[in-house]
Interface confidence: medium
């Protein structure tokens, strides 16, 4: 029956001290891990991989390196200035045989707009990706190549959650056997046909994504063909039947009252840790109202926070969240009005999310300012608008054409924003820096890996 199918990939997620420094608390880090895993779970579960359906993800274990671990010699991710290939290698030098995949989340600004890196799975041979076991490689080191890394920073800015979720889905897509999309069928965002182009590129597009186009969180047919071949061959090696929650992964899942991790991680006076006997683990301790693992509206003293306490900061598009006094959850924040400016006036709020372009405020569409001969690139990091479906009207917000809306004020894209039709990202000097999708690969060829591994790592 379907329920007995091995369709769940169990994850080990580690975060480094810089990720912790950005999000501030263990609970906030766990919420980030949870949101990323749920996002890819939704994408993969709703994709039919040539008859293989309901592929899901579950966190088996987490390790959060806090700022206190910055000097810990047992923490391999403690070094401040590590390139993306080295960072992936540090993850791969650990033994991850107990997991389908092992990821590290960081907040580092890697070179050239790289947001992630992962080993690519293949249907045959020991090449990396899902279920790959630790082996000795030609540089004399044992490595687990069922690994990947992602960062939430790009050119000094933090990427929006939807982009980070797609980055994670993209890197996991490599682990599952998909190379980058190529060819007209699988890169519609590069099409000259406006109807095709407006839906954007798919998850495995090699360069940049905004995350808000129809295709951005879907796999292309190219990816589906590749992934289904790898799943066919590999999933029985390490996938498990879905169902039981995993007490100890720090996430409160169905059937658990709380989850503060294993005894070495649990700092929670409210919850029985995962090393406790079966009837007690991941249950609230007697007389305790809640556990901080359930949400930000529970105090360390195991009581619901009072009605007036803030649990979520006011953001560009949503008002602050206020605890309601009877649940650990942070209630929904009321959205700010649609078309409120956000992301430093480059975008507008839609249903509480900073999602639309500032152009939409005036009934226009965002476009890329690029001269047809490709020589004039100084406006590539301007916000440019056009009349709907009329690229001939595309002009910078600073142009005379749109002066009635923007009063001649040039609005520039935020650093880290996609530019030049998603071929690159804007840097801090407002230059559009093209993404070299295979840059780290080329550097790795000069490094420590043997030739048979070269084609099996990708951004």
């Amino acid at each position: 029956t379907t329920s007995a199918e091995k369709n769940t990939c169990q994850l080990y997620i580690q975060t480094d001290h810089l990720f912790f420094k950005y999000y501030g608390t263990r609970e906030a880090v766990i919420a980030q891990i949870s949101s990323h895993v749920k996002a890819i779970d939704t994408i993969y579960q709703t994709t039919d991989f040539s008859g293989i359906r309901n592929i899901s993800f579950m966190v088996k274990r987490i390790r959060i390196n806090t700022t206190a671990d910055e000097k810990d010699p047992t923490n391999p991710f403690r070094f401040p200035n590590i390139g993306v290939e080295k960072f992936l290698e540090l993850n791969s030098e650990q033994n991850h045989d107990d997991y389908c995949l092992a990821y590290v989340f960081t907040d580092r600004d890697f070179d050239d707009g790289v947001l992630g890196l992962a080993w690519v799975g293949a249907p045959s041979g020991s090449s990396g990706g899902i279920c790959e076991k630790s082996k000795l490689y030609s540089d004399g080191k044992k490595k687990s190549l069922n690994t990947g890394i992602i960062t939430v920073q790009n050119y000094g800015s933090h990427v929006p959650p939807k982009v980070s979720h797609i980055t994670f889905a993209h890197e996991v897509g490599h682990n599952f056997g998909s190379p980058h999309d190529s060819g007209t069928e699988c890169t519609p965002g590069e099409s000259k046909n406006l109807g095709q182009k407006e839906n954007g590129n798919y998850i495995m597009y090699a360069r940049a994504t905004s995350g808000d186009k129809l295709n951005n969180n879907k796999f292309s047919l190219c990816s589906i063909r590749n992934i289904s071949q790898v799943l066919e061959k590999k999933r029985n090696n390490c996938f498990v039947e879905s169902g039981q929650p995993i007490c100890g992964n720090g996430m409160v899942e169905q059937g658990e009252e709380c989850d503060c991790g294993y005894s070495d991680q649990c700092k929670d006076e409210c919850c029985f840790d995962a090393n406790q006997p079966e009837g007690r683990k991941c249950k609230l301790k007697p007389g305790k109202q809640c556990s901080p693992s359930q949400g930000p509206c529970c105090t360390a003293q195991c009581a619901f926070k009072s009605k007036s306490e803030k649990c979520r900061d006011d953001s560009d598009c949503a008002r602050e969240g206020i605890c309601n006094g009877f649940t650990a959850l942070c209630p929904a924040s009321d959205p700010k009005p649609n078309f409120t400016d956000c992301n430093r006036h480059t975008q507008v709020c839609i249903n509480g999310q900073c999602a639309g372009s500032i152009c939409e405020k005036y009934g226009l569409e965002e476009c890329t300012c690029a001269s047809s001969d490709g020589k004039d690139d100084k406006e590539l990091c301007h916000v440019c608008c056009m009349k709907k479906m009329d690229p001939s009207t595309c002009a910078s917000t600073g142009s005379v054409q749109w002066s009635r809306h923007f009063s001649g004020r040039t609005i520039t894209l935020q650093p880290g924003s996609p530019c030049n039709d998603f071929r690159g990202y804007c840097d801090v000097f407002m230059r559009c820096r093209l993404v070299d999708a295979d840059g780290p690969l080329a550097r790795l060829k000069k490094a420590i890996f043997s030739p048979e591994l070269y084609e099996n790592i990708a951004e």
């Epitope: 996002a39 959650p161 996430m251 409160v252 899942e253 059937g255 009252e257 359930q294 650990a328």
Partner: nanobody
Amino acid sequence: EVQLVKSGGGLVQAGGSLRLSCAASGNIFINNAVGWYRQAPGKQREMVAAMLSGGSTNYADSVKGRFTISRDNAKNTVYLQMNSLKPEDTAVYYCNVQVNGIWARWGQGTQVTVSS
């Protein structure tokens, strides 16, 4: 995008009962927190019942002992059983689900009117 379809509202006498249901597209309620909110005319929207992803439930003091939140994963549906209704329970009721740490957008809501 999450689609939430509410039903079960209506007019009821004080002391009566109603069951609201909220069906979702896909198995979105599994492993996600869900909540029922209400908004009475001229008042702030307030959460009245919540179910954490683990299944434990919490209620606003004003409805504790009268309202029960539950879910049926097989039907992708969340329910709010409302007993011993009072005129002050009159409001538009919304269900909501937390997806990727963000609460899904508000739907139309369903009107509940309790007459005395």
